[in-house]
């Protein structure tokens, strides 16, 4: 907290300019009018203020806008944004995508990792949250912007938050944006993707839907197996176990096409391991891959889950 002291004679700032870099902290506090600062915020980042001086300027803005900064100030914060806490940002009402982009850009510039971080820092997450809430939904332009800065952004949202993503926004999603999503999140995103891409033809559809298939039900996988899609093993390994189990050997063979040979290398891992346990060994042998662990000939398969449901 900076003490209130009178501004020395002749030092009252008439504009935000380079002469202020020679002001001590108490002089900045006493001699810079907060309203002037607010109207000339765009100048602050073009002047080499020290971090300590920036703290004083922030303090002045906080006093002028105790209820939160207006967007006209927010859009010009630049490096001063890095001084903001989540509590500060919760008071803001950010509606312009340009403002959001400008602040994300500055923040990205100050993140030490050369790779884009998977999840935003707390103050950035708060900024994004305020912005999305203000818009009411995650529209395509917003999603485009956020995933460009944070490839893992979508996967940082809860299934409830993801439910506000309109199917039209799914076109902005790239495969890498879903890398860290868990099955619950893909369960929400998959039906939206299916809707978004429904008018595409077979091969184009598969390319687009592929990264969302971790949320696909059995019937959709069965349908895909009829379309010569040649799913790769990496995609197959991300499918829901409960969706894979009911697939027949013939269906899996059609689904994977030439990639079916990869099952051998994955036979100890889910969902392949659990699927093998559900297949007749005779059927598995038709693949010629040496997969072991299927149901021996002459054994009866009882579906206990069905039995429990009936009792």
């Amino acid at each position: 907290e900076v003490e209130k002291t009178a501004c020395p004679s002749g030092k009252k700032a008439r504009e935000i300019d380079e002469s202020l870099i020679f002001y001590k902290k108490w002089e900045l506090e006493a001699c810079v009018d907060a309203a002037l600062l607010a109207t000339q915020m765009d100048r602050v980042n073009a002047i080499p203020f020290t971090y300590e001086q920036l703290d004083v300027l922030k303090h002045k803005l906080d006093e002028l806008y105790p209820q939160g900064y207006p967007e006209s100030v927010i859009q010009h914060l630049g490096y001063l944004f890095l001084k903001m806490s989540p509590e500060d940002i919760r008071k803001w009402n950010v509606t312009s995508l340009e403002t959001l982009k400008a602040l994300l850009e500055v923040n990205k510039g100050h993140e030490m990792s050369p790779q884009a971080p998977r999840r935003p820092l707390p103050q950035v997450a708060t900024l994004i949250d305020r912005f999305v809430k203000g818009r009411g939904q995650l529209d395509k332009d917003t999603l485009d912007t956020l995933t460009a800065f944070y490839p893992g952004y979508l996967c940082s949202l809860s299934p409830e938050e993801l439910s506000s993503v309109p199917p039209s926004s799914i076109w902005a999603v790239r495969p890498q944006d879903l890398d860290t999503c868990d099955p619950r999140q893909l369960d929400v995103l998959y039906p939206k993707a299916r809707l978004a891409f429904q008018n595409m033809n077979g091969s184009e559809y598969f390319v687009k839907i592929q990264s969302f298939l971790g949320g696909a039900p059995t019937e959709d996988l069965k349908a895909l197996s009829q379309q010569n899609v040649s799913m790769d093993l990496a995609t197959f390994m991300k499918l829901r176990t409960d969706a894979v189990l009911p697939l027949t050997v013939a269906e899996v063979q059609k689904l994977l096409g030439p990639h079916v040979e990869g099952l051998k290398a994955e036979e100890r891992h889910r969902p392949v391991r659990d699927w093998i346990l559900r297949q007749r060994q005779d059927d598995l042998d038709t693949l010629g891959l040496g997969l072991q662990g299927g149901i021996p000939n002459g054994y009866l398969v009882l579906d206990l889950s069905m039995q429990e449901a009936l009792s």
């Epitope: 980042n45 080499p48 971090y51 490096y79 982009k101 850009e105």
Partner: nanobody
């Protein structure tokens, strides 16, 4: 990856002019105020000039005010420094910078030598 590449330096006689350029890439140039900073042989770093994001306001160290002019072209992501009436004390390596407080946002520099 953020890259700032300065050019235009060289040996020049006192009273003459030079124009430095800085080609920026790997970030949204138009989102940043930009700066020129210099380091004279055996001396510390000195901020020279800054320009706002919009280019609407420019700022200068007292030692160069009235002689140097900073400008920017967002269409080519380029920052400029027009240096007129050069003096021996302007001899330095000149760096362009996104943030003069952080060395990791500077280019590799271009040497300006003012000598008769």
């Amino acid at each position: 990856e953020v890259q700032l590449v300065e050019s235009g330096g060289g040996v020049v006689q006192p009273g003459r002019s030079l124009r430095l350029s800085c080609a920026a890439s790997g970030f949204t140039f138009s989102s940043y105020a930009m700066h020129w900073v210099r380091q004279a042989p055996g001396k510390g770093l000195e901020w020279v000039s800054g320009i706002t994001r919009s280019g609407g306001a420019t700022f200068y160290a007292g030692s160069v005010k009235g002689r140097f002019t900073i400008s920017r072209d967002d269409s080519t992501n380029t920052l400029y420094l027009q240096m007129n009436s050069l003096r021996a004390e302007d001899t330095a390596v000149y760096y362009c910078s996104r943030d003069p407080r952080r060395v990791d946002y500077w280019g590799q520099g271009t040497l300006v030598t003012v000598s008769s």
